[in-house]
């Protein structure tokens, strides 16, 4: 299980999101609300649950969250891009364990996800797309706390094989 | 200008090592992966690996683990890719390139080294 | 690995011609697929991302399209700067791979 647990470079992702989150939450219409229902829901996922938690959450913010959002700025359209692109890297990285079947998905794993795709499709689909933006700093709070994460000083000793 | 310039051509012996370069200019060289492609002469295109700029982490294909590495020097912008234990079918042009950051993301090599040369040849 | 077989190989077509040419997946790769483009002695070219997406600067003559397994790239007017060889690119699995190439000559 520990090859599933992803090695990557969170400084970088959350420093994105820090210059960006007030921007971000100020356009918040629905302050509220809440669409990954707080840490605690993500709080009592079990270690066998992480790695199928992560690829469902990661896959909520590339396939529906970064798709929906409409960015005017410039600057924040970059940072929020360049979030998207990590957890894209991310996302590939799960998968090599899902083909190595590695990454097994549990109906309490499911169910964490399916709340908070329900709670996305409560409210219009942009107000959704900045509320779930707003919110990263749970899921990378919930990456850190579950993940071997690397600072930017160490993450150069660490690298992934990829199979042939 | 944005570019991408690599190191120039390399003539080395079966069971040596190269490490080419890959110097970025014209933007946030820790703001794209960098992946290393290679193409031995006539033929198609293969994929060796991406190294993280920012971070200094690394995805290698399994058909080039243990023999390659993939290093950067973010105070001059530049990547590195070293091979090791040459063979004559390591004769290749050895590109770098770099990722697209898009919305929605996805992957694209929308830069590209101009290309290095590598003749293995005893 | 995953195999992305290319077709034709090779083809031959006039200025003006709509060209099309396919690429299959062994297995489903949703749309995480490129298309390229490469010269004699140059670099290749990014044309399309993420299966359809146009790539910024590349003529609308090029278009991309499909997911799964089936990808075609389409040339709606065959043009005297696109005669190359082309790329398909898959990035869903690793280790990412290309077709072998289909190489556009004049007719």
């Known amino acids: 299980l520990r090859r599933c647990l992803i090695s990557t470079d969170m400084d970088h992702i959350e420093d994105s999101f820090q210059e960006i989150k007030r921007a971000i939450q100020a356009k918040d219409t629905f302050p509220n609300v809440t669409i990954l229902s707080t840490l605690e829901t993500l709080q009592i996922i079990k270690p066998l649950d992480v790695c199928c938690v992560t690829k469902n959450l990661l896959a909520f913010y590339v396939d529906r969250v970064f798709k929906d959002h409409q960015e005017p700025n410039p600057k924040i359209l970059r940072k929020i891009s360049s979030i998207a692109n990590s957890f894209l890297y991310m996302q590939k990285t799960l998968r090599q364990c899902q083909e190595q079947r590695q990454c097994h998905c549990r109906q309490e794993a499911t169910n964490v996800t399916r709340v908070i795709h329900d709670n996305y499709d409560q409210l219009e689909v942009r107000s959704a797309a900045v509320k779930s933006l707003g919110e990263l700093d749970i899921f990378l709070a919930w990456i850190a706390k579950n993940h071997e994460v690397t600072s930017s000083a160490a993450a150069h000793h660490h690298h992934h094989h990829s199979g042939s | 200008q944005v570019q991408l310039v690599q190191s120039g051509a390399e003539v080395k012996k079966p069971g040596a090592s190269v490490k080419v370069s890959c110097k970025a200019s014209?933007?946030?060289?820790?703001?794209?992966?960098l992946h290393w492609v290679r193409q031995a002469p006539g033929q198609g295109l293969e994929w060796m690996g991406w190294?993280?700029?920012?971070?200094?982490?690394?995805n290698y294909a399994q058909k080039f683990q243990g023999r390659v590495t993939m290093t950067r020097d973010t105070s001059i912008s530049t990547a590195y890719m070293e091979l090791s234990r040459l063979r004559s079918d390591d004769t290749a042009v050895y590109y770098c390139?770099?990722?697209?950051?898009?919305?929605?993301?996805?992957?694209?090599?929308?830069?590209w080294g101009q290309g290095t040369l590598v003749t293995v040849s005893s | 690995a995953i195999q992305l077989t290319q077709s034709p190989s090779s083809l031959s077509a006039s200025v003006g011609d709509r060209v099309t040419i396919t690429c299959r997946a062994s297995?489903?790769?949703?749309?995480?697929f490129g298309w390229y483009q490469q010269k004699p002695g140059k670099a290749p070219k990014l044309l399309i991302y993420?299966?359809?997406s146009l790539q910024s600067g590349v003529p609308s003559r090029f278009s991309g399209s499909g997911s799964g397994t089936d990808f075609t790239l389409t040339i709606s007017s065959l043009q005297p700067e696109d005669f190359a060889t082309y790329y398909c690119?898959?990035?869903?699995?690793?280790?990412?791979?290309f077709g072998q190439g289909t190489k556009v000559e004049i007719k």
């Open positions: 297995q489903d790769i949703r749309s995480d």
């Open positions: 390139a770099r990722d697209i950051v898009v919305l929605p993301p996805a992957i694209g090599f929308d830069l």
């Open positions: 690119l898959q990035d869903y699995n690793y280790p990412w791979t």
């Open positions: 993420a299966a359809s």
């Open positions: 014209g933007y946030t060289f820790t703001g794209y992966y």
């Open positions: 190294i993280n700029p920012n971070s200094g982490g690394t």
